[in-house]
């Protein structure tokens, strides 16, 4: 609506502002043991690990933007359990990263973001 | 714990890890309208913006990631009334940015992320 | 093992400031906030602060805030609490702990005794 | 400052007997994620403290089975089930939900 009112490097900016926000995979950082759901007597060092996972804005307030594609990150983790029975353990600890993202209506029945072992 | 156990490439990887998840300034996107508690009548285009946000992990459970210092960025953004009485008009929104985060016990009563006019 | 070792005992006169040191060894030490407690003679236990290793920021107990300043050197995995003006009081048992992620203080240093006495 | 108030502050106990230690603290330690950062400490004579129990009721390594704590609120117990020679000394409840991280006063436990 607005090309004839304002200049096109106006509009650019805008527009490229616009399409840094649009639903996407971004670098975001998760706390392992709460993914998990372990209990309290289990944790992880480090806690927390980067993966990507599905964030920004949609078009219409209705929409979410959701993961529709993920693959499973092998991240390399000492677990350790509380009481200390043996050396803390050097385990693969298998995180969802979202590859692929869309602006969509309702959250699917099951997310794909839970790590799995 | 571990340096006896384990080769320090491994060792070096883990901890590379656990830095990029530390506390500090990330590139996030936000709704402008909501942070700036407009009323539903009044909407942008772009409705989001990018910004740096306080984000990421902190060495105690206990402890939240918060902004210590803050500048504001102003984003031109189309702000539009409806019903469309006039033109949307092309406006500086000041946006809170963040630029120092710490590790904090308790959320300090008036924090710095509101985006001002 | 994890392992806290601290400097010696240290007799200082009132006014004087000291600088007690704790050297850690067998863990990630820019992974773990380092606590400062200390222990008057006889007394319970005192909190006076922490510092994070990784950023270098501190939080202090207010009751100490202008006397105290926690350092540390990432590159000797040290870390360090230096009490200024001292009075007769501060007379105590310095001790360093390392704090894990869930809060609690799960290894402690065996103490720095600092006596302040004319 | 949070007020941490241990009871009793010292105690004769019988060899092979239970005991049992209380804090309550002056607010909640309930903090904003659901968790409550409430520990138990030991000290043995001329020894620094020793991490005994964390987050209310976790055993921390390498710490026995007698040794157990409870609570939730204000309200906490730390409880020995069969007390041995080796746990005479003094044990602080301590919190590090808030600043600054405060201690009770300390439960000096002696054998009768």
């Known amino acids: 609506f607005a090309a004839t009112f304002y200049d096109i490097e106006t509009l650019k900016v805008i527009d490229e502002e616009w399409q840094r926000t649009q639903c996407s995979p971004r670098e975001t950082c998760v706390e392992v043991a709460s993914e998990l759901g372990k209990s309290t007597n289990t944790f992880f060092k480090p806690p927390c690990v980067n993966v990507f996972r599905c964030g920004g804005c949609c078009n219409e307030e209705s929409l979410i933007c959701m993961n529709t594609s993920t693959s499973y990150i092998s991240k390399q983790l000492f677990e350790i359990s509380v009481p200390l029975t043996s050396v803390p353990e050097l385990v693969p600890v298998k995180v969802a990263n979202h590859t692929g993202c869309k602006c969509l209506p309702t959250a699917p029945r099951h997310p794909y973001s839970i790590i799995r072992r | 714990f571990a340096a006896t156990f384990y080769d320090i490439e491994t060792l070096k990887v883990i901890d590379e890890e656990w830095q990029r998840t530390q506390c500090s300034p990330r590139e996030t996107c936000v709704e402008v309208a909501s942070e700036l508690g407009k009323s539903t009548n009044t909407f942008f285009k772009p409705p989001c913006v990018n910004v740096f946000r306080c984000g990421g992990c902190c060495n105690e459970e206990s402890l939240i990631c918060m902004n210590t210092s803050t500048s504001y960025i102003s984003k031109q953004l189309f702000e539009i009334s409806v019903p469309l009485t006039s033109v949307p008009e092309l406006v500086p929104v000041k946006v809170a940015n963040h630029t120092g985060c710490k590790c904090l016990p308790t959320a300090p009563r008036h924090p710095y992320s509101i985006i001002r006019r | 093992q994890v392992q806290l070792v601290q400097s010696g005992a240290k007799v200082k006169q009132p006014g004087a400031s000291v600088k007690a040191s704790c050297k850690a060894s067998?863990?990630?030490?820019?992974?773990?906030?380092m606590y400062w407690v200390r222990q008057a003679p006889g007394q319970g236990l005192e909190w006076m602060g922490y510092?994070?290793?990784?950023?270098?920021?501190?939080t202090y107990n207010q009751k100490f805030k202008g006397r105290v300043t926690m350092t540390t050197d990432t590159s000797t995995s040290t870390a360090y609490m230096e009490l200024r003006s001292l009075r007769s009081d501060d007379t105590a048992v310095y001790y360093c702990?390392?704090?894990?992620?869930?809060?609690?203080?799960?290894?402690w240093g065996r103490g720095t005794l600092v006596t302040v006495a004319s | 400052d949070i007020v941490m108030t241990q009871t009793p502050l010292s105690g004769p106990v019988t060899l092979g007997q239970p005991a049992s230690i209380s804090c309550r603290s002056s607010?909640?330690?309930?903090?904003?994620?659901?968790?409550?950062?409430l520990h138990w400490l030991q000290q043995r004579p001329g020894q620094p403290p020793r991490l005994l129990i964390y987050?209310?009721?976790n055993r921390f390594s390498g710490v026995p089975d007698r040794f157990s704590g409870s609570g939730a609120g204000t309200d906490f117990t730390l409880k020995i089930s069969r007390v041995e020679a080796e746990d005479v000394g003094v044990y602080y409840c301590?919190?590090?939900?808030?600043?600054?991280?405060?201690f009770g006063r300390g439960t000096k436990l002696e054998i009768k």
């Open positions: 607010q909640s330690l309930v903090h904003s994620n659901g968790n409550t950062y």
């Open positions: 702990a390392r704090t894990s992620y869930y809060g609690g203080m799960d290894y």
């Open positions: 301590s919190q590090s939900t808030h600043v600054p991280r405060t």
């Open positions: 067998g863990y990630t030490f820019t992974g773990y906030n």
């Open positions: 510092i994070d290793p990784y950023s270098g920021d501190t």
């Open positions: 987050k209310v009721s």
